[in-house]
Amino acid sequence: QAGPLPKPTLWAEPGSVISWGNSVTIWCQGTLEAREYRLDKEESPAPWDRQNPLEPKNKARFSIPSMTEDYAGRYRCYYRSPVGWSQPSDPLELVMTGAYSKPTLSALPSPLVTSGKSVTLLCQSRSPMDTFLLIKERAAHPLLHLRSEHGAQQHQAEFPMSPVTSVHGGTYRCFSSHGFSHYLLSHPSDPLELIVSGSLEDPRPSPTRSVSTAAGPEDQPLMPTGSVPHSGLRRHWE
């Protein structure tokens, strides 16, 4: 007896983090036996979209011509073959930026910091938010997700770095978000260039030591003042 149909592969082009108003295409790739593809959005009352396969039938395209809040969320896809529906794909989290006004990112005491010293990146929003995200450009996992304790809304989050090494240098941005949808982010802050001087270390960045990498066995997790990292919300953007 045949086992369950293999799960399809789900991905988004140009990526899964999309600015408001931009287009995105979601692809679901199954097998050549597929007769129909279905895209389901988490907690949607009905299938999100259904499409006939593109020749040679092993994938389907789900188009979003203009990204809005409606489309942000967690998706899975399935395909139907003559023997029934497949297993679900691994989830795809589609995040929309531009839902709220941009926060301000600054460095205290200064964006110019000596190796071995401390610096705190401060992300401030005009209106109270309960989630703040710090992005480092070109980091392997460029997102650190910090959520206020008890859902308390705050105007800012602090990202302390100590001791600073050369790998902390680089360009950072931050986002803010409301707890009711972690798939809706603000516009990005203006970039902040953190310059680390006086270091004798190898200046090449090590992704495993990146400030914005999810905490591993060697990493010291960043603890924002009055906030805690919330593992259920930490996401990696490739």
Epitope: L39, E43, S44, P45, A46, P47, E69, G73, W85, F180
Partner: antibody, heavy 122, light 109 residues
Framework: QVQLVESGGGVVQPGRSLRLSCAAS????????MHWVRQAPGKGLEWMAG????????YYIDSVKGRFTISRDNSKNTLYLQMNNLRAEDTAVYYC???????????????WGQGTLVTVSS | DAVVTQESALTTSPGETVTLTCRSS?????????ANWVQEKPDHLFTGLIG???NRAPGVPARFSGSLIGDKAALTITGAQTEDEAIYFC?????????FGGGTKLTVL
């Protein structure tokens, strides 16, 4: 044109069972989700249950979970509502309504039947 | 359990713009509630107007539009007609069930 015709209503004693049917025509029934919605005398609408196009997902309002079962037979273009352990407060006109093919295409509750009256009384 | 609240009655004049609203007891109505609007005409004739991803049902005039205004869902009729006199129900989705509002009786005088 799209038509939904409910049947199976009537007068029944508390604690007894009833099965409602909704015969669909004028569209490809197997492509659409379906709902049961009721309206008690002089009251507003109350959604009861919904089922996906292929029957894989079923949803119920808390007050009927375990007592009512929604099902469908796509080969017969028919939607069903099996109602067990009926109570006086289940007295209402029961409507079937069509759902969407998918969320990006169509409007839930776009077409409705004319309703069938269920009276639960001793 | 969530309660969905609508204006019990509204009156407008032909050609005027009228907005009906739909409030959730659980907080702000969001896109995840998939606000839906159903029209009831005399003799219990129900028709879905707007829902899904803000889709308008085929045959529904363009003067009907759905939106989120503040923390509520809204149905706006731009240039009401006498034939728009009806009861309008909104329905909101709560993760695994729908809840209808009590309905708004719209009179077009």
């Amino acid at each position: 044109q799209v038509q939904l015709v409910e049947s199976g209503g009537g007068v029944v004693q508390p604690g007894r069972s009833l099965r409602l049917s909704c015969a669909a025509s004028g569209f490809t029934f197997s492509n659409y989700g379906m709902h049961w919605v009721r309206q008690a005398p002089g009251k507003g609408l109350e959604w009861m249950a919904g089922i996906w196009f292929d029957g894989t997902n079923k949803y119920y309002i808390d007050s009927v979970k375990g007592r009512f079962t929604i099902s469908r037979d796509n080969s017969k273009n028919t939607l069903y509502l099996q109602m067990n352990n009926l109570r006086a407060e289940d007295t209402a006109v029961y409507y079937c309504a069509r759902d969407v093919i998918s969320m990006v295409r169509g409007v839930p509750f776009d077409y409705w039947g004319q309703g069938t009256l269920v009276t639960v009384s001793s | 359990d969530a309660v969905v609240t609508q204006e019990s009655a509204l009156t407008t004049s032909p050609g005027e713009t009228v907005t009906l609203t739909c409030r959730s007891s659980t907080g702000a109505v969001t896109t995840s509630n998939y606000a839906n609007w159903v029209q009831e005409k005399p003799d219990h004739l129900f028709t879905g107007l707007i829902g899904g991803i803000n889709n308008r049902a085929p045959g529904v005039p363009a003067r009907f539009s759905g939106s989120l205004i503040g923390d509520k869902a809204a149905l706006t009729i731009t240039g009401a007609q006498t034939e728009d006199e009806a009861i309008y129900f909104c329905a909101l989705w709560y993760s695994n069930h729908w809840v209808f509002g009590g309905g708004t009786k719209l009179t077009v005088l």
